[in-house]
């Protein structure tokens, strides 16, 4: 029962995580115009992985796609790639994990197959989560670097008489969505891997018991049964369990509050 719960919970957590990764990838607010210690403009700029947007004071919003591949920074391309890989792996993982769920019976699928599928999906979720976290972190690092570079430019003397407004960008909502979603996918994957251990069929070994029939000295050595009903008293055979003690890890994530301008 605990195994089914762990597997089910892992699936749900991963599902939420992957939905979050997809949402973050599609969101336009990966970076938003820094409003602190900046000239107050009548427009608000924000950028995503696929397009940049401007919201005017009237509420009118205009977005322009990045209609170039070669002209984009390599880091942005890398972030896009990481997020897409994360989504693809997560989607495949979800598909695999649906068939691996203990509560769903598909034909005569054995528990060993379900265990393998659970492990596979768990690993996929872990890698998917890591991809998302890596992608978001690379973008965040890029933002921090650019932020301090543009801050330095703001306070150094301008060459000519004409000044240009240096728009600085800070962390957008998509980054936090991405981090949380990646973390959830990772946790879900870990839970699936834990559930896999519980799903693995128990190799039941029986000690050889010799039966002494009267007048004959023949020893019967019955082989270990793969499955046992578990009912009735077993006086003749002493059952030995391999790895009988199993622990289930309870993974708890504590949300962190990020204050940003």
């Amino acid at each position: 029962m605990a195994v089914t719960a762990c597997q089910g919970l892992g699936f749900v957590v991963s599902l939420i995580g992957i939905a979050g990764i997809i949402a973050a990838t599609c969101m336009d607010q990966w970076s938003t115009q820094d409003l602190y210690n900046n000239p107050v403009t009548a427009v608000f700029n924000y950028q995503g992985l696929w397009r940049s947007c401007v919201r005017e004071s009237s509420g009118f919003t205009e977005c322009r796609g990045y209609f170039t591949l070669l002209g984009l920074p390599a880091m942005l391309q890398a972030v896009r790639a990481l997020m897409i890989v994360g989504i693809v792996l997560g989607a495949i993982g979800l598909l695999v994990s649906i068939f691996a769920l203990k509560c769903i019976r598909i034909g005569s699928m054995e528990d060993s197959a379900k265990a393998n599928m659970t492990l596979t999906s768990g690993i996929m979720f872990i890698v998917s989560g890591l991809c998302a976290i890596a992608g978001v972190s690379v973008f965040a690092n890029m933002l921090v670097t650019n932020f301090w570079m543009s801050t330095a430019n703001m306070y150094t003397g301008m060459g000519g008489m004409v000044q240009t407004v240096q728009t600085r960008y800070t962390f957008g909502a998509a980054l936090f969505v991405g981090w949380v979603a990646g973390g959830l996918t990772l946790i879900g994957g870990v839970m699936m891997c834990i559930a896999c251990r519980g799903l693995a069929p128990e190799e039941t070994n029986y000690k050889a018991v010799s039966y002494h029939a009267s007048g004959h000295s023949v020893a019967y050595k019955p082989g270990g049964f793969k499955a046992s009903t578990g009912f009735g008293s077993n006086t003749k055979n002493k059952k030995i369990y391999d790895g009988g003690a199993r622990t289930e890890d309870e993974v708890q994530s504590y949300p962190s509050k990020h204050d940003y301008v």
């Epitope: 107050v40 009548a42 401007v54 509420g59 322009r64």
Partner: antibody
Framework: EVQLVESGGGLVQPGGSLRLSCAVS????????MHWVRQAPGKGLEWVAY????????YYADSVKGRFTVSRDNAKNSLYLQMNSLRAEDTAVYYC????????????WGQGTLVTVSS | DIVMTQSPDSLAVSLGERVTMNCKSS????????????LTWYQQKPGQPPKLLIY???TRESGVPDRFSGSGSGTDFTLTISSVQAEDVAVYYC?????????FGQGTKLEIK
């Protein structure tokens, strides 16, 4: 038809106060930011203040900061400008202006109300 | 604050003539996010409130005759009237609508010879 009608102007002594009102009709007032712009007799235009549709953003010209207060009542379709510590240089025609949907432009202007600060 | 400087202060032209007036800002009014310039042109006829002519430096407001056109980017902008009509006699103002406080140029007065 968009209409902006200013009222409340008049003669006031230096150091005195005045409250201008702007009654709006012909558009959804609560959806648009609003400006006050003034023009001294025979002079050019001077932007005075801006208030966003939801009153979250309010900006003033340096020359009026701390003395003038812009406010709005979306339920009454009205814009206000409270002017305190008035000076002779505040003498002007005050226009109530709608902030345009595109380009942050000032697209519709009222006829203006004259404020004269003199002793 | 951004300083807007218009030139010339006034000009007198004949009917049907082409006229250009300039506006220079002390800071760039170009927003890289949407590749637009936040400069607006207004026309003020005697005894009337100003009227919006052009926004985004080059986009004509609806109802404005196509003889009016705006151009320029960054800090240098131009308003052109391709064929001046009698009703174009007015003062023309440019305005920074990018950075608060919003600022106007001192105006260019257009007269007919």
């Amino acid at each position: 038809e968009v209409q902006l009608v200013e009222s409340g102007g008049g003669l006031v002594q230096p150091g005195g106060s005045l409250r201008l009102s702007c009654a709006v009709s012909g558009f959804t007032f609560s959806s648009f930011g609003m400006h006050w712009v003034r023009q001294a007799p025979g002079k050019g235009l001077e932007w005075v203040a801006y208030i966003s549709s939801g009153t979250t953003n309010i900006y003033y010209a340096d020359s009026v900061k701390g003395r003038f207060t812009v406010s709005r009542d979306n339920a009454k379709n009205s814009l206000y400008l409270q002017m305190n510590s008035l000076r002779a240089e505040d003498t002007a025609v005050y226009y109530c202006v709608r902030s345009g949907y595109y380009g942050s432009s000032l697209d519709y202007w009222g006829q203006g109300t004259l404020v004269t600060v003199s002793s | 604050d951004i300083v807007m400087t218009q030139s010339p202060d006034s000009l007198a032209v004949s009917l049907g003539e082409r006229v250009t007036m300039n506006c220079k800002s002390s800071q760039s009014l170009f927003n890289s996010g949407n590749q637009r310039n936040y400069l607006t042109w207004y026309q003020q006829k005697p005894g009337q409130p100003p009227k919006l002519l052009i926004y985004w430096a080059s986009t004509r407001e609806s109802g404005v005759p196509d003889r009016f056109s705006g151009s320029g980017s960054g800090t240098d902008f131009t308003l052109t009237i391709s064929s001046v009509q009698a009703e174009d006699v007015a003062v023309y103002y440019c305005q920074n609508v990018y950075i608060y406080p919003l600022t106007f140029g001192q105006g260019t007065k257009l007269e007919i010879k």
